[in-house]
């Protein structure tokens, strides 16, 4: 995929942006006590464009799409207490902790790299 | 797909934008005289966000991605002259003529609706 676009010559005053915003995330599981954890969400406005196509195609279709998604994240275990469940007194859930966000190609799978 | 987002409560000063810009498109075919035609390209900054995931998933993954793409286009024949090609004196190419652009779900196939 081509590199993300941060600036466009046609719109010099416009910049792509993609931020990691602090959020409080509720982690829950049926029959267990929910936990609030501090996390981050990715939010932004990346550039996209679409140039008219032809048949037969003369070149590769000129369509570009960037999306604001995690650039670095890690998965942590959050343990929930489940009172009244003797068989399953505790439940482990994996939670994605987002570290950094960036504009990346829309089709791309978000990175889940450790630190 | 959820409807495109134009405003975000977290960023009240930010707006999604997606414009149809006039362009001159060169339509060519090997051995034929290229033609310049007036067309439009879509260009913009739509909103995207990504909320941390969990395993097992508690809810649907909260990932949203809009992209600036044709909302209305039609395909027209552009005929190229091919001097010196007795067998193929003319070549027809289909060219997408973009009418309007809008922020639409990233995975969506661009619309090729008539007027």
């Amino acid at each position: 995929a081509p590199p993300p676009i941060n600036k466009l010559a046609l719109f010099p005053d416009k910049s792509a942006w993609c931020e990691a915003k602090n959020i409080t995330q509720i982690v829950g599981h049926s029959g267990c006590e929910a936990k609030s954890i501090q996390n981050r969400a990715c939010l932004g406005q990346c550039f996209s464009y679409s140039v008219p196509n032809t048949f037969p195609q003369s070149t590769e279709s000129l369509v570009h799409c960037d999306s604001c998604m995690p650039a670095q994240s890690m998965w942590e275990i959050v343990t929930l207490e489940c009172p009244g469940h003797e068989e399953v007194p505790r439940v482990d859930k994996l939670v994605e902790k987002i570290v950094h966000c960036s504009c990346q190609a829309c089709g791309k799978e978000p990175s889940h790299e450790g630190l | 797909a959820p409807p495109p987002i134009n405003k975000l409560a977290l960023f009240p000063d930010k707006s999604a934008w997606c414009e149809a810009k006039n362009i001159t498109q060169i339509v060519g075919h090997s051995g034929c005289e290229a033609k310049s035609i007036q067309n439009r390209a879509c260009l913009g900054q739509c909103f995207s966000y990504s909320v941390p995931n969990t395993f097992p998933q508690s809810t649907e993954s909260l990932v949203h991605c809009d992209s600036c793409m044709p909302a209305q286009s039609m395909w027209e024949i552009v005929t190229l002259e091919c001097p010196g090609h007795e067998e193929v004196p003319r070549v027809d190419k289909l060219v997408e003529k973009i009418v309007h652009c809008s922020c639409q779900a990233c995975g969506k196939e661009p619309s090729h609706e008539g007027l």
């Epitope: 048949f55 037969p56 | 395909w75 193929v88 003319r90 289909l94 003529k97 008539g114």
Partner: antibody
């Protein structure tokens, strides 16, 4: 002289995928001088154009069928194929493959003899 | 309902002349070339006319095509019994972004 021959099952069950192949003889698909098409004709009705393919693999589909249609080319076998997914009784028709006059849109100068496809359980 | 409008049927005696009309709009016939096809019973269509008025090799000059504005006409002179067939007009439609055909005209040679 170029000839086209359609082949494939004559009976397809509803919701399944219709698959047809057109074999080109007497000329090469990869010469690049022609567009290749699929066209269908419902019983006792007119003609409906389905889509185009070029030897390079570039395709263009009728927007009314686009979500269900895939046309592909195999230049090594001198064949091009049609796949139509999620078929219903409304897809029962004679299916023709055709060649356009040299790189002209909509002037089909050579046709296969057609193959009748019935969609029924 | 076809995008291009043709009369369902026409008839004439052997040796006579007949015309078949094809009516459309500016998004199809008005701005694109028209082709005509002959379909004999039980056979595949055969190209008679392309680029409004050109005949492929092997098509006799009894067949002619013309176009004016958003309508096209196929003419057949010196009618023969072997001309009994369905005739279709076809062109590109920019608004529909697709190739389109008329509903067909059945020619009967009396």
């Amino acid at each position: 002289q170029v000839q086209l021959q359609e082949s494939g099952p004559g009976l397809v069950k509803p919701s399944q995928t219709l698959s047809l192949t057109c074999t080109v003889s007497g000329g090469s698909i990869s010469s690049g001088g022609y567009y290749w098409s699929w066209i269908r004709q419902h019983p006792g009705k007119g003609l409906e154009w389905i889509g185009y393919i070029y030897y390079s693999g570039s395709t263009y589909y009728n927007p009314s069928l686009k979500s269900r249609v895939t046309i592909s080319v195999d230049t090594s076998k001198n064949q091009f194929s049609l796949k139509l997914s999620s078929v219903t009784a409304a897809d029962t028709a004679v299916y023709y493959c055709a060649r356009d006059a040299p790189l002209r849109i909509g002037a089909f100068d050579i046709w296969g003899q057609g193959t009748m496809v019935t969609v029924s359980s | 309902q076809s995008v291009l409008t043709q009369p369902p049927s026409v008839s004439a005696a052997p040796g006579q002349k007949v015309t078949i009309s094809c009516s459309g709009s500016s998004s199809n016939i008005g701005n694109n070339y028209v082709s005509w096809y002959q379909q004999l019973p039980g056979t595949a269509p055969k190209l008679l006319i392309y680029d409004n008025n050109k005949r492929p090799s092997g098509i006799p000059d009894r067949f002619s095509g013309s176009k004016s504005g958003t309508s096209a006409t196929l003419g057949i002179t010196r009618l023969q019994t072997g001309d009994e067939a369905d005739y279709y007009c076809g062109t590109w439609d920019s608004s529909l972004s697709a190739g389109v055909f008329g509903g067909g005209t059945k020619l009967t040679v009396l």
